[in-house]
Amino acid sequence: LLVSQGVLLKCQKGSCSNATQYEDTGDLKVNNGTRRNISNKDLCASRSADQTVLCQSEWLKYQGKCYWFSNEMKSWSDSYVYCLERKSHLLIIHDQLEMAFIQKNLRQLNYVWIGLNFTSLKMTWTWVDGSPIDSKIFFIKGPAKENSCAAIKESKIFSETCSSVFKWICQY
C-alpha cells in the first residue's frame, strides 16, 4: 500500500488502483517531523509486471520488488530520506517469506533499519506507508514509545532508538 496525494494506492501487477478500504490524506511522518509524500509515480513506475520488473544495478529482485542493502550506517530518519531520494522507501515486510529473503541477503548479524516506527499520534507501530503492523505476523521486541524505530536482526524485529546508526534496506 502506498500513500499518494490524497488517496492510498495499491501497486498491483504494475498498475496503481484506488484502494476502496482507505481514502487517506496526508504525508509520511518521521519522529522529528513531516517528510514529503511517497508518490504513486515514484513507487509504481517500476512495476510493469511481477515477471518483467527491472531492478537498477546493485538492487536485488524478489517477488516483483527491488531491494537495496546499504553498506554505510545512518539514523532511521536519514535512512528514510536516503530511500525517498532514490525513488524508493525503507523496507516494508509483508510476510515471513519476505523476511527470509531479507535475512538470506544480509551478510552480517548487526541491526538493520526497516520502514517501521512508533508514532505516539496513534500509539501504534506504523509502516512508512501509514499501515499499522500486523501483530499476528510480527512481534516487536523492546519498548513501544516515542522515538522508537524498528530494526531487524536474525529474522526478528527490535525496537531501537531512532537516532542510533545502523545499515538499512530500501525497497521499491
Epitope: Y22, G33, S120, L121, M123, T124, D129, G130, E146
Partner: antibody, heavy 112, light 110 residues
C-alpha cells in the same frame, strides 16, 4: 461507510451502548474516534481506539465511557448517564497518517 | 487536559469578503502540524477541510487556507461564498493518542 446505532431515550443513571457499524473499511488498521455534540453546542472528543485495540479517552470521559471493537463494529458503552450526556454521537475514522477524520457517520441521538 | 480555544465564536462576512478564524492549543500539537479544520452545517456531520495545518483535503476549494504551527493556527476563507455559511471547528492531534476540538466558529453571511 460508518453508521451509528443504539441512540434512544434513557433515564438518568442508566447505561447505553452505541454501535458504529463499518462497511468497506479494514477496521483492523483504522484509528476510530467517538465524538459527541450536544444540541446547539460544539464538537467534543470522547475517545478513540487504535489498530491494536487500545482505547484512549478524554480526561472527563475516563471511567464512564468504554470503547471496544470487533472486526466490523466499534462500540461506545456509557454508564451513569446524566442530562449533560444528551447529544448526537458520531463515530469517525482517521486517515492513515494524520489525526484528521476523513470519514464520519451521520450520528445517533441520545436523550437522557 | 488539553484545551483548544477558537476565536471568534461568531463572525459576519459579506460575499466576496475574507474571514479569519484563529485556533490556539494549550500544548503543541503532534509534529507541530497535526491540526485539522472541519466545516459543519446543521443536521450534517463535520466535513474535513484541511489537515496537517495547511494541506487542503480532496475536493475542497482553494479559497480555504490553513496556516500555523505548534500552538497557533489560522483558517482563512478568501472570497467567501454563500455556501461557506457554516460552523468551523479546529481539532488538534497529540501524543498519547489524544485529540481535542476547538469550540467552533459560526460564519454568518450578511
Amino acid at each position: 461507510s460508518l453508521e451509528e446505532s443504539g441512540g434512544r431515550l434513557v433515564t438518568p443513571g442508566g447505561s447505553l451502548t452505541l454501535t458504529c457499524t463499518v462497511s468497506g473499511i479494514d477496521l483492523s488498521s483504522a484509528y476510530m474516534n467517538w465524538v459527541r455534540q450536544a444540541p446547539g453546542k460544539g464538537l467534543e472528543w470522547i475517545g478513540a481506539i487504535n489498530s491494536p485495540g487500545v482505547a484512549y479517552y478524554a480526561s472527563w470521559a475516563k471511567g464512564r465511557f468504554t470503547i471496544s471493537r470487533t472486526s466490523t463494529t466499534v462500540d461506545l458503552k456509557m454508564t451513569s448517564l446524566t442530562t449533560e450526556d444528551t447529544a448526537t454521537y458520531f463515530c469517525a475514522r482517521e486517515a492513515a497518517t494524520t489525526s484528521a477524520n476523513n470519514l464520519w457517520g451521520q450520528g445517533t441521538l441520545v436523550t437522557v | 487536559q488539553i484545551v483548544v480555544t477558537q476565536t471568534p465564536a461568531s463572525v459576519s462576512a459579506a460575499v466576496g469578503g475574507t474571514v479569519t478564524i484563529s485556533c490556539q492549543s494549550s500544548q503543541n500539537v503532534y509534529g507541530n502540524n497535526e491540526l485539522s479544520w472541519y466545516q459543519q452545517k446543521p443536521g450534517q456531520p463535520p466535513k474535513l477541510l484541511i489537515y496537517k495545518a495547511s494541506t487542503l483535503a480532496s475536493g475542497v476549494p482553494s479559497r480555504f487556507k490553513g496556516s500555523g504551527s505548534g500552538t497557533q493556527f489560522t483558517l482563512t476563507i478568501s472570497g467567501v461564498q454563500c455556501d461557506d455559511a457554516a460552523t468551523y471547528y479546529c481539532q488538534g492531534g497529540y501524543s498519547g493518542g489524544m485529540r481535542s476540538f476547538g469550540g467552533g466558529t459560526e460564519v454568518v453571511l450578511v
